[in-house]
Interface confidence: medium
């Protein structure tokens, strides 16, 4: 069962309940397990149980994590996958989701995906399936690994609400974030906007409405006047470094 479910959004005011058949696991209705976080009206409610979060796809993990087996060769076919910390710049990767926000996977290395680095028409990154071993992450876990080949196919960047696979598909000021069962371009958060801070591993779960990260020069921190509030209702906002 899922360890946690988190529902949040950039703009969604009417959040469906985290259960009620809205989301599920393969072959079953979703069931709440310990560690549920549910954001409604900017209040977080949490139940304590911080275990590594099992996942089936990258989108179930936080924006600073990806889904894979915990250690090389630790899991065979059908082995448990968990959310692992993203890889920083210049670290080895096999797909975009492995790289931390602001980076993408190019030639097996996490590179900055700064919009200024791309020509106006943006380089399309074709996804190819690669079943080879990922020597820096999990190998032999039975799941296809994605890597990229860059081909100079120029296209317009996705506007807000456009379908996307990764943030580099979106126009400047937007990121690619989960929205129900797909991903769309959403605005990068501005100063003062509510953000999602995954403080501890396993505390987030599937973000049905995923927020973008804070914009340049901003960090997701507890809002000052919320310091006195209990752990379960601390509000995070994008603030200047």
């Amino acid at each position: 069962t899922l360890n946690s479910v988190l529902i949040n959004s950039n703009a969604i005011k009417n959040l469906p309940p985290p259960l009620g058949g809205a989301g599920g696991q393969p072959g079953s209705a979703v069931s709440v397990a310990p560690g549920v976080l549910y954001e409604g009206g900017n209040k977080y409610q949490t139940l304590d149980n911080y275990q590594p979060y099992p996942c089936a796809e990258d989108e179930e993990c936080g924006s600073d994590e990806y889904c894979s087996s915990p250690s090389r060769g630790a899991a065979g076919v059908g082995g448990v996958q968990i959310c692992l910390a993203c890889r920083k710049r210049r670290k080895r990767c096999m797909r975009h989701a492995m790289c931390c926000p602001g980076n993408y996977c190019k030639n097996g290395i996490c590179m900055p995906s700064d919009h200024s680095h791309f020509p106006r028409g943006e380089i399309e990154e074709s996804i190819i399936e690669n079943l080879g071993n990922d020597h820096n992450a999990a190998a032999g876990d039975g799941y296809p690994r994605r890597t990229t080949l860059t081909s100079k196919i120029y296209h317009t960047k996705g506007q807000e609400g456009s379908v996307c696979l990764r943030s580099s598909d979106c126009a400047a000021g937007l990121c690619c974030a989960r929205h129900f069962w797909s991903k769309i371009c959403k605005p990068v958060l501005k100063e003062g906007q509510v953000c999602t801070k995954h403080k501890r591993k396993g505390s987030h779960g599937l973000e049905i409405f995923q927020r973008c990260y804070c914009g340049e020069g901003l960090a997701c921190r507890i809002q000052k006047d919320h310091h006195q509030a209990s752990n379960s209702s601390r509000l995070h906002t994008c603030q200047r470094h």
């Epitope: 005011k13 469906p16 989301g23 599920g24 696991q25 979703v30 179930e60 807000e160 609400g161 069962w181």
Partner: antibody
Framework: QVQLVESGGGLVQPGGSLRLSCAAS????????MSWVRQAPGKGLEWVSG????????YYADSVKGRFTISRDNSKNTLYLQMNSLRAEDTAVYYC???????WGQGTLVTVSS | DIQMTQSPSSLSASVGDRVTITCRAS??????LHWYQQKPGKAPKLLIY???NLQSGVPSRFSGSGSGTDFTLTISSLQPEDFAVYYC?????????FGQGTKVEIK
């Protein structure tokens, strides 16, 4: 180009079952969420169900919850809708669609009648 | 559930006319709104996504505007192939819901 082709529709008695299929091509199927949408004869559009790219997460309209099951086989680039306990009001053209309906199939007609 | 109300339910217009269709959501849906065109016996075709973005391959005479609860689809100069039914659809929350449709007929 993106292509979605539905099949499996037909005439079925109330209480019966039917399984719809949607064959996808022209895009990386496993990377996209998919939906089923239906349209009763002469009526408007109704979203039925959605599923994430890996198939791990599913979503249903209240009108079909507990009776319909959405699934996918990414190795076959195919989306499914298993429909059980069918009712007369389920009669409609069923469309499969990519993402939030940015591309649609041509539809398959399901008629529930005795 | 979010109710989507389109107006008018039908309209008659001539080729070259400027046509405006409105869609109102029962609650704030930000810009999570699509506009579709559907012709008889065909699947709907996405025209506008994210309330105001033109889908690739759609003629520029189509435009969308609005945010929150009130949205508009405008056809700047109606062409013969534009006579069809138009639907709005919100994707802000589950269940995703459509407007009842606006039929654009030849005057």
């Amino acid at each position: 180009q993106v292509q979605l082709v539905e099949s499996g529709g037909g005439l079925v008695q109330p209480g019966g079952s039917l399984r719809l299929s949607c064959a996808a091509s022209g895009f990386t199927f496993s990377s996209y969420g998919m939906s089923w949408v239906r349209q009763a004869p002469g009526k408007g559009l109704e979203w039925v169900s959605g599923i994430s790219g890996s198939g791990s997460y599913t979503y249903y309209a209240d009108s079909v919850k507990g009776r319909f099951t959405i699934s996918r086989d990414n190795s076959k680039n195919t989306l499914y809708l298993q429909m059980n306990s069918l009712r007369a009001e389920d009669t409609a053209v069923y469309y499969c669609a990519r993402h939030y309906m940015d591309h649609w199939g041509q539809g398959t007609l399901v008629t529930v009648s005795s | 559930d979010i109710q989507m109300t389109q107006s008018p339910s039908s309209l008659s217009a001539s080729v070259g006319d400027r046509v405006t269709i409105t869609c109102r959501a029962s609650q704030d849906i930000s810009n999570y709104l699509h506009w579709y065109q559907q012709k008889p016996g065909k699947a709907p075709k996405l025209l506008i996504y994210g309330a105001s973005n033109l889908q690739s391959g759609v003629p520029s005479r189509f435009s969308g505007s609005g945010s929150g609860t009130d949205f508009t689809l405008t056809i700047s100069s109606l062409q013969p192939e534009d006579f069809a039914v138009y639907y709005c659809q919100q994707y802000d929350s589950i269940p995703m819901t459509f407007g009842q449709g606006t039929k654009v007929e030849i005057k």
